[in-house]
Each structure stands twice: as C-alpha cells, then as structure tokens.
C-alpha cells in the first residue's frame, strides 16, 4: 500500500559524495511518527534495510551508518516510512539520494580558461581534463548541493576534457571536478585540486545554480 503517508526526507551526513573508506550516515526523518523506516538501495542489486524509528520532539528518524564507504554500497537510496509492523503500509518514497564514492582514480586537472581572476560580468568557462579516458566530468562548487556534469571529449593532445560554461561572472567560488566512467556512474575519481575563482568588481548575486540537478547519474551499477 504505497503512499499511505507523505514521503519522509533522506539526508547524508556529511554529504552524498563520500571518499573511499570514509564514513557516511544516511538519515531518514519525518514529522509523521513512523515506527520503522525502510531504506532501499538501487545498485548492482536492490537491497532493503528495515530501521527502527526513534521519536524526539515531534520528529521520527533513523540512522544507517556506513563506517567505511565502498563501491558495493554506492547507488541510489530512497527511504520509506512505515507505521504498522505487519503487513507494511509504507509511505511514498523520499526523493532519491545518489550516494557516490569518490577517490577511486587519478585526479583530473581543473583550470579557468581566462585565468582564476575575472572581471564581473565576464563569461567564465572552467575546463576539466585528464589523461584517463573518463566519459563524464562532474563540477562541484563549494556550498552548492548539486554538481554540473558534462561528457568528456578527446583532445588532440591525448587528454579527455569537458568545458563548463558558467556564464557571466558575479560572485567567485571554490570549484572542484571529478571524472567518472559511464558504466560506473556512482564511482568517481579523486577530486581535482580546488580552483578558487575570484571576481573583481561589484557583483550582486552568484552564478545561477544548475538548472538540472544531477540526481540521477545513470543506470545503477556496482563495481568492485
């Protein structure tokens, strides 16, 4: 009986990009007093865990702690709430949360085509490249929830590159990029060295956030 209750929320602490062998806590929570939460993962196989809800201050929640992140645990997670024990009457699913393992392959290089210091209003393009044959690059900005992603293209110098047009410069920011292979969308490279883009002038607001959050990174797979 899916959808008897409104969907819970699913969060990742400290975040959904998790370094290999590091800890991540997935937290299901809701203002509905759920007795249990079902944490479902789409990966190489579909797995579901039943978690006991804890009630505090009008909120029910349950934590699933991954003490060491591995490729086998990466994937798209969803949380369902359940009030009755048997049979399960589950809520609508939470919004999907892609848990990505990072730090698996060599880091790409990140550079600003016009240099890291730009004039306000100037068009900014960041280039991510590597000698590794990555199919996809992911560009993250500190403080933004979602990454932009672009397919990598081969260059004559033997590298694979993607150019991210950010539009007219307003605020600066710290950027990082990651490479991945299309058939392992939840497994990313080490982070590039951070690139601090600074804007000279008098900006009023930051670059627009990506219009299409990359919550679905492709067909779920698992690798090692």
């Amino acid at each position: 009986h899916e959808g008897v209750h409104r969907k819970p929320s699913l969060l990742a602490h400290p975040g959904r990009l998790v370094k290999s062998e590091e800890t991540v806590i997935l937290q299901c929570w809701s203002d509905v007093m759920f007795e249990h939460f079902l944490l479902h993962r789409e990966g190489m196989f579909n797995d579901t865990l039943r978690l006991i809800g804890e009630h505090h201050d009008g909120v029910s929640k349950a934590n699933f702690s991954i003490s060491r992140m591995t490729q086998d645990l990466a994937g798209t997670y969803r949380c369902y709430g359940s009030v009755t024990h048997s049979p399960y009457q589950v809520s609508a699913p939470s919004d999907p949360l892609d848990i990505v393992i990072i730090g698996l392959y060599e880091k790409p290089s990140l550079s600003a085509q016009l240099g890291p210091t730009v004039l306000a209003g100037e068009n900014v393009t960041l280039s991510c490249s590597s000698r590794s044959s990555y199919d996809m690059y992911h560009l993250s900005r500190e403080g933004e929830a979602h990454e932009r992603r672009l397919p990598a293209g081969p260059k004559v110098n033997g590298t694979f590159q993607a150019d991210f047009p950010l539009g007219p410069a307003t605020h600066g920011g710290t950027y990082r990029c990651f490479g991945s292979f299309h058939d392992s969308p939840y497994e990313w490279s080490k982070s590039s060295d951070p690139l601090l883009v600074s804007v000279t002038g008098n900006p009023s607001n930051s670059w627009p956030s990506p219009t299409e959050p990359s919550s679905k990174t492709g067909n779920p797979r698992h690798l090692h």
Epitope: T48, L73, F181, N219, H222, L223, H224
Partner: antibody, heavy 115, light 110 residues
Framework: EVQLVQSGAEVKKPGSSVKVSCKAS????????ISWVRQAPGQGLEWMGG????????NYAQKFQGRVTITADESTSTAYMELSSLRSEDTAVYYC????????WGQGTLVTVSS | QSVLTQPPSASGTPGQRVTISCSGS????????VNWYQQLPQTAPKLLIH???QRHSGVSDRFSASKSGTSASLAISGLQSEDEADYYC???????????FGGGTKLTVL
C-alpha cells in the same frame, strides 16, 4: 593487507551438501560484497552469487538459484556458501572473493563429489 | 559455452607484445566495465585491470587494456616468462543479472 582465508578441502557424496567458509581480515567486512566463484577442473570461472554483509541479502546466479545459500556473519567477518543436492559436475575449486567485481580472492577450496 | 568470447590460446616470445581479445554484447561489455584477471597454475585468480583500463595496485605497467563498444582487449608488452598463465575477462551482465567470465586464454611464452 586484505586476506580471505577459506576452509579446507571436502569430499562429498552425491545428493549431500557442502558448506565452505571464508574469513576476511585486513578490511571492512560489512561494507564489501563477498562473491563466490567456482572453477571445475581444467575449466573457466563461474560466478555463483554474492552478499553484502551490511545488507544481508544474498543474490544468486540463475543457474544456482534454489541450490546455493550464501550467508555472512558480521561478528566473525566470515562468509559462507552452502551448495546442496551435490552431483559429480559440482566437483570444483570454490573461491570467495571481495566485491561483485572481485579484486581480492581466497586461496580456494577443493570440493570433490564422488560416490 | 561462455557468454564472453576469448581465444583459447595465445603465444609470444620474450620481449614481444601480445593482445588478448574479449567479445561480448550490449548487455555486458556494452553497458558495464570490464575486469581482467591473471591465473597462474594452481593459484587463485589475480586482478590485473578494473574499470576497462585501470591497473590494479601493484600491477606492472606492461599490462594495459581498452574497451570499445561490445569488445575489450588486454595487451601485454615486453613479454616475460612469468606472464605464462590463463587470462580471463569479466563483466557484469544486465540480462543474466550476474558476473560473467570469458572462457579464458592460455598464454604461452615461447
């Protein structure tokens, strides 16, 4: 250093069952899948199934569905593979390996099925 | 009959470069990454290459691999006598929902 140490060789009668163990050390047992792969004498490798201990749900190759049971004991960092209704064609070396795309492998356990 | 097709044998002389092919379909190599394993006589398989072309830690740079479409290949340059072994390709298969292996290629160093 990741190590997977398997139980010793077994000789079994047709129709019986065998249970092979695989103890992991040097890594995080719960977070990695454990796969079981077998190799008949002079033949290639054949994936039987696997389990991610932290989830506890095993997944099996279609060929072995209903005849194999894969389990994991997080408290002892040990995975088990039980194969039932043994026949002579099940004579093989059985390997446990880390991951659904395995990187580290156990030393193998020879299971001989003979009347 | 293996789902991934490899030549049963390959050979070369010391110092030579040899290539081993692995052919599959859209449900395996075409949509998933390829691993390559080396199995020396009477030992467990050892991972050489993962994610199509990434060498596993400690593997010599004489080993390289690539993937194109539904085929993959492993290249061994500067062939040495200790490379004599069986080599297997492997990939996940979405239709079979499982890991599949090639039939293996026996490499002989002449």
């Amino acid at each position: 250093e990741v190590q997977l140490v398997q139980s010793g060789a077994e000789v079994k009668k047709p129709g019986s069952s065998v249970k092979v163990s695989c103890k992991a050390s040097g890594g995080t047992f719960s977070s990695y899948a454990i796969s079981w792969v077998r190799q008949a004498p002079g033949q290639g490798l054949e994936w039987m199934g696997g389990i991610i201990p932290i989830f506890g749900t095993a997944n099996y190759a279609q060929k072995f569905q209903g005849r194999v049971t894969i389990t994991a004991d997080e408290s002892t960092s040990t995975a088990y593979m039980e194969l039932s209704s043994l026949r002579s064609e099940d004579t093989a070396v059985y390997y446990c390996a880390r991951g659904f795309n395995p990187d580290y492998w156990g030393q193998g356990t020879l299971v001989t099925v003979s009347s | 009959q293996s789902v991934l097709t490899q030549p049963p044998s390959a050979s070369g002389t010391p110092g030579q470069r040899v290539t081993i092919s692995c052919s599959g379909s859209s449900s395996n190599i075409g949509s998933n990454t390829v691993n390559w394993y080396q199995q020396l006589p009477q030992t467990a398989p050892k991972l050489l290459i993962h994610h199509n072309n990434q060498r596993h830690s400690g593997v010599s740079d004489r080993f390289s691999a690539s993937k194109s479409g539904t085929s993959a290949s492993l290249a061994i340059s500067g062939l040495q006598s200790e490379d004599e072994a069986d080599y297997y390709c492997a990939a996940w298969d979405d239709t079979l929902t499982g890991l599949i292996f090639g039939g293996g290629t026996k490499l002989t160093v002449l």
